[in-house]
């Protein structure tokens, strides 16, 4: 068992490899055709370590001339994956990440998949479809979400520290009951943020404090019984 005066509880959510997609089935394509074409850009939060499937505009493949996926990742040259229907050829330029691939053969499915999403997959993804009727495109601002590791411990008299380590975006920390708190954020080069909240409770009838961490990947609460003030022996409540 951990010592009450040191770290009491930690949590890191485990996720089985889930898959997320904004793609639509054929029925939806028929119903939403004009709507989807109008929605050119989509912001899309995706949990790290899941699989993601990104879709082109819902255009029948028989009408296609060229499909191009343009991928702009931070600090990297723009990568393009193109498929030309007439010659049935695919071409890649500046694409080094082997986890970003066509879902299947592009002549059968124009969707793009990211296997095991990583922080480095944060960026802008755009599908451009060239047809005799014009060019259609659909873009995704992919925001990779990272679940923070949460810890709660005491470091001195009636003072507790709650940390949400390496979350993306930054987590929000609140306390029950409210204390006299100071919050700091530490930004890491990979885009994650550590939030540290240190609180003190002067009120002596506060027995246990709860740290509540709110995050886009889910919320987590930890609690800890406060240690007695040194020298305090007996009190009536």
């Amino acid at each position: 068992q951990p010592n009450n005066s040191l770290m009491l509880q930690t949590s890191k959510e485990n996720h089985a490899l889930a898959s997320s997609s904004l793609c639509m089935d054929e029925k939806q394509i028929t119903q939403n055709y004009s709507k989807v074409l109008a929605e050119v850009n989509t912001s899309w939060p995706v949990k790290m370590a899941t699989n993601a499937v990104l879709c082109c505009p819902p255009i029948a493949l028989r009408n296609l001339i060229i499909i191009t996926w343009e991928i702009i990742l931070r600090g990297q040259p723009s990568c393009t994956k193109a498929y030309k229907k007439e010659t049935n050829e695919t071409k890649e330029t500046n694409c080094t990440d082997e986890r970003i691939t066509w879902v299947s053969r592009p002549d059968q499915n124009s969707d793009l998949q990211i296997r095991t999403v990583a922080i480095t997959h944060d960026g802008y993804y755009r599908c451009i479809m060239v047809t005799p009727d014009g060019n259609f495109h659909r873009g995704y601002h992919l925001q990779v979400l990272v679940t923070p590791e949460v810890t709660l411990f005491q470091n001195r008299n009636r003072t507790a520290v709650c940390k949400a380590v390496a979350g993306k975006p930054a987590a929000h920390i609140s306390w029950i009951p409210e204390g006299d708190c100071a919050t700091k954020q530490e930004y890491w080069s990979n885009g994650t943020v550590t939030v540290k909240s240190t609180c003190h409770w002067e009120v002596h009838n506060v027995s246990t404090v709860t740290c509540h961490v709110s995050h886009l990947t889910g919320n987590k609460s930890l609690y800890i019984e406060l240690l007695p003030v040194p020298g305090a022996k007996k009190s009536a409540k």
Epitope: P2, I176, T208, V209, S221, Y223, P228, P230, K234
Partner: antibody
Framework: QVQLVQSGSELKKPGASVKLSCKAS????????MHWVKQAPGQGLEWIGN????????NYDEKFQGRATLTVDTSTRTAYMELSSLRSEDSAVYYC???????WGRGTLVTVSS | DVQMTQSPSSLSVSVGDRVTMTCQAS??????LHWFQQKPGKAPKLLIS???NLEDGVPSRFSGSRYGTAFTLTISSLQDEDIATYFC?????????FGQGTKLEIK
């Protein structure tokens, strides 16, 4: 796995005192508050007080202040609750609990009768 | 002291029912709590710690949630062995205080 083993049932006369014990294992005894709770027959639960074995710091509910005495023996990892000037309304099951109320003993039945 | 108001005090139920009970702290005081199950002659058994964390070995039909300063224990589909008294314990403030209990009885 935290275990709290409580002493056996007690039959006492009004005005007497009783001392209950609670022996802990499976956790750092001196690092967690030990609490005592009363449950009278057919009644709800009442918090009596708590003691921090690492320092001997104690809190009592006002209702039990002066009649309940909480102590610990860290060498045997045992917490004690003594209740004095017993009366019939003290007849109840008394529980010790620790780990922020997540681990409970099985309780000790105290019967006060003349 | 923080008073815990638990409702209902008793409930007539049938196997398969969805059962809900609530605890609320006096004056809407923000607190944290545990939920316990108690059967006659037995010590309370912890079901849910910290308002919503299901304890190991507790069936998934039990769940706890927080709505502001109100807390709910839900049994999604009642089983015979769930007939018992349920109570909450707030552990944020001294003195710790308990709900008066919700007793489940078979119709």
């Amino acid at each position: 796995q935290v275990q709290l083993v409580q002493s056996g049932s007690e039959l006492k006369k009004p005005g007497a005192s009783v001392k209950l014990s609670c022996k802990a294992s499976g956790h750092t005894f001196t690092s967690y508050w030990m609490h005592w709770v009363k449950q009278a027959p057919g009644q709800g639960l009442e918090w009596i007080g708590n003691i921090y074995p690492g320092s001997g710091s104690i809190n009592y509910d006002e209702k039990f202040q002066g009649r309940a005495t909480l102590t610990v023996d860290t060498s045997t990892r045992t917490a004690y609750m003594e209740l004095s000037s017993l009366r019939s309304e003290d007849s109840a099951v008394y529980y010790c609990l620790t780990m922020t109320g997540t681990s409970w003993g099985r309780g000790t039945l105290v019967t006060v009768s003349s | 002291d923080v008073q815990m108001t638990q409702s209902p005090s008793s409930l007539s139920v049938s196997v398969g029912d969805r059962v809900t009970m609530t605890c609320q702290a006096s004056q809407g005081t923000p607190i944290n709590l545990h939920w316990f199950q108690q059967k006659p002659g037995k010590a309370p058994k912890l079901l849910i710690s910290g308002a919503s964390n299901l304890e190991d070995g507790v069936p998934s039909r039990f769940s706890g949630s927080r709505y502001g300063t109100a807390f709910t224990l839900t049994i999604s589909s009642l089983q015979d062995e769930d007939i018992a008294t349920y109570f909450c314990l707030q552990f944020t403030y001294i003195p710790w205080t308990f709900g008066q209990g919700t007793k489940l009885e078979i119709k």
